[in-house]
């Protein structure tokens, strides 16, 4: 399960982005039918996202961000104004709405931070790429929620449990997108900030940062270690490659339903392998 992120090939948002469509699981409802108020809200937001992409596709690159934001803003505002239940009950109509509102807020803030300071053309790409991925994560969590009644849901995932790793995949993509748009000297800082924000957003605040997920923290540390003694201009690339491989390994471990300890071991081994490959590719420097 390769993460499919290619920093050298920027995405073309107008044509390529497919925002999440949170179809409920087959046993919960007919495909594509939202079953909860929260799913209805995210469906409306996704519809607005698509409409905004279409609007932005028809304008000059320098005007894309402004056009997207204006169109998506009206749609998002309308989605919140209409529901949940069409009542003006503020940010915390219910505990589930409060959680969704916080996730969406974090997603919008992250997209804005990612795009901040970029040229108008790059701003659009960064904002849409980040928001697209964040909406996909949020919609994914709502699909899971549709399977069980809210009362049966585990509110906070205990640290070390593997089901959070699927969200790490997406958080990594968001952070990598942000970092690759940043100046060379800021890439690590931007990556770490965006990675933490995305993890926090996708887990509804259950995890404040990657450091709260032991397996992931170990992987990040090893990925950083892989960059020691590498040339400055490739340090970030080495780090990203190593961490990407580690997260891929974690995902595979999760699919195979291995325990957390095994996943950590797999991730550690993967980082080691990636380190070897990366250092070989950059002139054989090794710690």
């Amino acid at each position: 399960a390769d993460l499919g992120y290619g920093p050298a090939t920027p995405a073309a948002p107008a044509a390529g982005y497919t925002p999440a469509t949170p179809a409920a699981p087959a046993e919960a409802a007919p495909a594509g039918k939202a079953t909860t108020e929260e799913q209805k809200l995210i469906e409306k937001i996704n519809a607005g996202f698509k409409a905004a992409l279409a609007a932005a596709a028809g304008v000059q690159p320098a005007d894309k961000y402004r056009t997207f934001v204006a169109t998506f803003g009206a749609a998002s505002n309308k989605a919140f104004a209409e529901g949940l239940s069409g009542e003006p009950k503020g940010a915390a109509e219910s505990s589930s709405k409060a959680a969704l509102t916080s996730k969406l807020d974090a997603a919008y803030k992250l997209a804005y931070k990612t795009a901040e300071g970029a040229t108008p053309e790059a701003k659009y790409d960064a904002y849409v790429a980040t928001l697209s991925e964040a909406l996909r994560i949020i919609a994914g969590t709502l699909e899971v929620h549709a399977v069980k009644p809210a009362a049966e849901e585990v509110k906070v995932i205990p640290a070390g449990e593997l089901q959070v790793i699927e969200k790490v995949d997406a958080a990594f993509k968001v952070a990598a997108t942000a970092a690759n748009a940043a100046p060379a000297n800021d890439k690590f800082t931007v990556f770490e900030a965006a990675f933490n924000d995305a993890i926090k957003a996708s887990t509804g605040g259950a995890y404040e940062s990657y450091k709260f997920i032991p397996a992931l923290e170990a992987a990040v540390k090893q990925a950083y270690a892989a960059t020691v003694a590498t040339a400055p201009e490739v340090k970030y690339t080495v780090f990203e490659t190593a961490l990407k491989k580690a997260i891929t390994a974690m995902s595979e471990a999760q699919k195979a339903a291995k325990p957390a300890a095994a996943a950590t071991a797999t991730a550690t081994a993967a980082v080691g392998a990636a380190t070897g490959a990366a250092t070989a590719a950059t002139g054989g420097y090794k710690v």
Partner: antibody, heavy 119, light 105 residues
Framework: ESGGGVVQPGRSLRLSCAAS????????IYWVRQAPGKGLEWVAM????????HYADSVKGRFTIFRDNSNKTVHLQMNNLRSEDSGVYYC?????????????????WGQGTMVTVSS | ELTQSPSSVSASVGDRVTITCRAS??????LAWYQQKPGKAPKLLIY???SLQSGVPSRFSGSGSGTDFSLTISSLQPEDSATYYC?????????FGQGTKVEIK
């Protein structure tokens, strides 16, 4: 806003609020009032499609809010006015979202119209 | 219910001024701050407790979550003379604090 003025207790007034330069039919609109020398108090709200209208307890049964999205206007019909209804009435746009995050605030206000209820 | 303190404050140009707003129950970060000058409509300064509204000078900042919030003017300017209101958006109806009047000495 327009429609304010001096009126005797028990009489009626109709306030209007005309909007421009934004997607009017995507926003909830509120009337907020301010008695002389006092703080801000919400009076009434209307949803984007008129399906939901809410009123402060102090005006329930006396005030009616309605909107005309095609003309980008919101109206507040005030009947059976009382002296305590006196003050400046503002229409305000309730915004849930901007590109930096959730907003949940009144981000656009009219200039206000004065209502004086006095015998 | 929202309680602002102090009800009024007098400070000199360049001073740091802090206004607090306390909610009777937790409202997460869904609090906004407004500035109102005499004879004018309120103006949104801060939303979501700490986000600066577009066009508002950076000397204004907001912080807090749960029940305790504050608005800080880092270096008071003559044009900041006004009444400041907090407003909660956690649950309807959206209520305002009673206001804090800021005067220039």
């Amino acid at each position: 806003e327009s429609g304010g003025g001096v009126v005797q207790p028990g009489r009626s007034l109709r306030l209007s609020c005309a909007a421009s330069e934004f997607a009017f039919d995507s926003y909830e609109i509120y009337w907020v009032r301010q008695a002389p020398g006092k703080g801000l108090e919400w009076v009434a709200m209307i949803s984007i499609d008129e399906t939901n209208k809410h009123y402060a307890d102090s005006v329930k049964g006396r005030f009616t809010i309605f909107r005309d999205n095609s003309n980008k206007t919101v109206h507040l019909q005030m009947n059976n006015l009382r002296s305590e209804d006196s003050g400046v009435y503002y229409c305000a746009r309730w915004n849930n979202w901007n590109h930096r995050g959730m907003v949940f605030a009144f981000d656009l206000w009219g200039q206000g119209t004065m209502v004086t209820v006095s015998s | 219910e929202l309680t602002q303190s102090p009800s009024s404050v007098s400070a000199s140009v360049g001073d740091r001024v802090t206004i607090t707003c306390r909610a009777s129950q937790g409202i997460s970060s869904w609090l906004a701050w407004y500035q109102q000058k005499p004879g004018k409509a309120p103006k949104l300064l801060i939303y979501s407790a700490s986000s600066l509204q577009s066009g508002v000078p950076s000397r204004f900042s907001g912080s807090g979550s749960g029940t305790d919030f504050s608005l800080t003017i880092s270096s008071l300017q003559p044009e900041d003379s006004a009444t400041y209101y907090c407003q909660q958006a956690n649950s309807f109806p959206y209520t305002f604090g009673q206001g804090t009047k800021v005067e220039i000495k």
